[in-house]
């Protein structure tokens, strides 16, 4: 009788699904540069700001090439996760002093949680370990003043715009191993 | 076109054994992780087994956790699995799938029963 | 005894809309996992019909459409044919099992 009818390819491959993460996260690269630019014009910064329930920036580039498609995707998503609660974080607890930075903020929030998911899928089609998207964390607590909130926004795009362009790089280099 | 076709499924007693092929075409094979999934007569789909793409990562269920192994051959583009210890609830629709599971092959029956 | 769980039957007559619902737990879907849908017409195969709560593969009609919230999930079909006349199934991964799981599955009837 023959062999049985295929599937029309339904949806993209994996390495297709890497090709739009990439570009999903250079466009996200760029939000946050832009959006970085806007909060130092307005609220000028002195010196480097850091926050300490941020992620520790997870890898240079140089030491990228020993890295797993397993381990980077998991570190990545865990990091974006957190980035991703800082944000909603800010908008909620400065809303007022920030609104200046709208509707970009929500942007933001919106393609990372956008990445976030694109992120689950890859690694599902992968079958790599799957984390909690939604694990339960500790609040953050309020920003202590108005300043404190601004030096915290500081802290917090100039942390994300680090991971993404380590990310961006990571995501390219583990292409070719897939 | 994708294309996954399972093969080695038959009759076998309980306590018996048997290896379950899966020959995929038309996409990536070593860049999708691969499932098995059954469906006992007239009963639900019942997830089995997954490995990751490159064979590094593997998963069962309780029901088949220590009987079953779950291999792979990405130069072959094929899929396995092997089924031991057999017992008569294993009598299912066995398929193999791709992906989320995105994809997934017409299946091969496995009987157990003296 | 599935781990999520589905209406064993549902019904409507053609140009109807039908809602399937799927109902889990804080080790699938209220885990904030991906909630995936598959139609198995009888006698053949299961097939994706949608992936990730709300993403329709090629070739899937915009009839059917998927939504999530909290620990439940459902799947929505407007304007009922008789070719959707099948079991459906949903899937999400679980924390506890460390593998996806599935739902008993809906049987549709499309009446008259």
């Known amino acids: 009788p023959g062999p049985p009818p295929g599937s029309p390819r339904a949806s993209p491959d994996p390495r297709a699904e890497l090709d739009s993460t990439v570009l999903l996260t250079r466009s996200l690269l760029e939000d946050t540069r832009q959006l970085t630019i806007q909060l130092k014009d307005k609220f000028p910064a002195d010196g480097d700001h850091n926050l300490d329930s941020l992620p520790t920036l997870a890898m240079s580039a140089g030491a990228l090439g020993a890295l797993q498609l397993p381990s980077v995707l998991t570190r990545l998503r865990a990091d974006l996760l957190s980035y991703l609660r800082h944000v909603q974080w800010l908008r909620r607890a400065m809303g007022s002093s920030l609104k200046t930075l709208e509707p970009e903020l929500g942007t933001l929030q919106t393609r990372l949680d956008r990445l976030l998911r694109r992120l689950q899928l890859l690694m599902s089609r992968l079958a790599l370990p799957q984390l909690p998207p939604d694990p339960p964390a500790p609040p953050l607590a309020p920003p202590s003043s108005t300043w404190g909130g601004i030096r915290a926004a500081h802290a917090i795009l100039g942390g994300l715009h680090l991971t993404l362009d380590w990310a961006v790089r990571g995501l390219l280099l583990l292409k070719t191993r897939l | 076109e994708v294309q996954l076709l399972e093969s080695g499924g038959g009759l076998v007693q309980p306590g018996g054994s048997l290896r379950l092929s899966c020959a995929a075409s038309g996409f990536t094979f070593s860049s999708y992780g691969m499932h098995w999934v059954r469906q006992a007569p007239g009963k639900g789909l019942e997830w089995v087994s997954v490995i990751s793409y490159d064979g590094s990562y593997k998963y069962y269920a309780d029901s088949v956790k220590g009987r079953f192994t779950i291999s792979r051959d990405n130069s072959k583009n094929t899929l396995y699995l092997q089924m031991n210890s057999l017992r008569a609830e294993d009598t299912a629709v066995y398929y193999c799938a791709a992906g989320v599971p995105d994809y997934w092959g017409q299946g091969t029956l496995v009987t157990v029963s003296s | 005894q599935s781990v999520l769980t589905q209406p064993p039957s549902a019904s409507g007559t053609p140009g109807q809309r039908v809602t399937i619902s799927c109902t889990g737990s804080?080790?699938?879907?209220?885990?904030?996992?991906?909630v995936h849908w598959y139609q198995q017409l009888p006698g053949t195969a299961p097939k994706l019909l949608i992936y990730?709560?709300?993403e329709r593969p090629s070739g899937v009609p915009d009839r059917f459409s998927g939504s999530k919230s909290g620990t439940s999930a459902s799947l929505a079909i407007s304007g009922l044919r008789s070719e959707d006349e099948a079991d459906y199934y949903c899937a999400a991964w679980d924390d506890s099992l460390n593998g996806p799981v599935f739902g008993g599955g809906t049987k549709l009837t499309v009446l008259g």
């Open positions: 804080s080790s699938n879907i209220g885990a904030g996992y991906d």
């Open positions: 990730s709560n709300n």
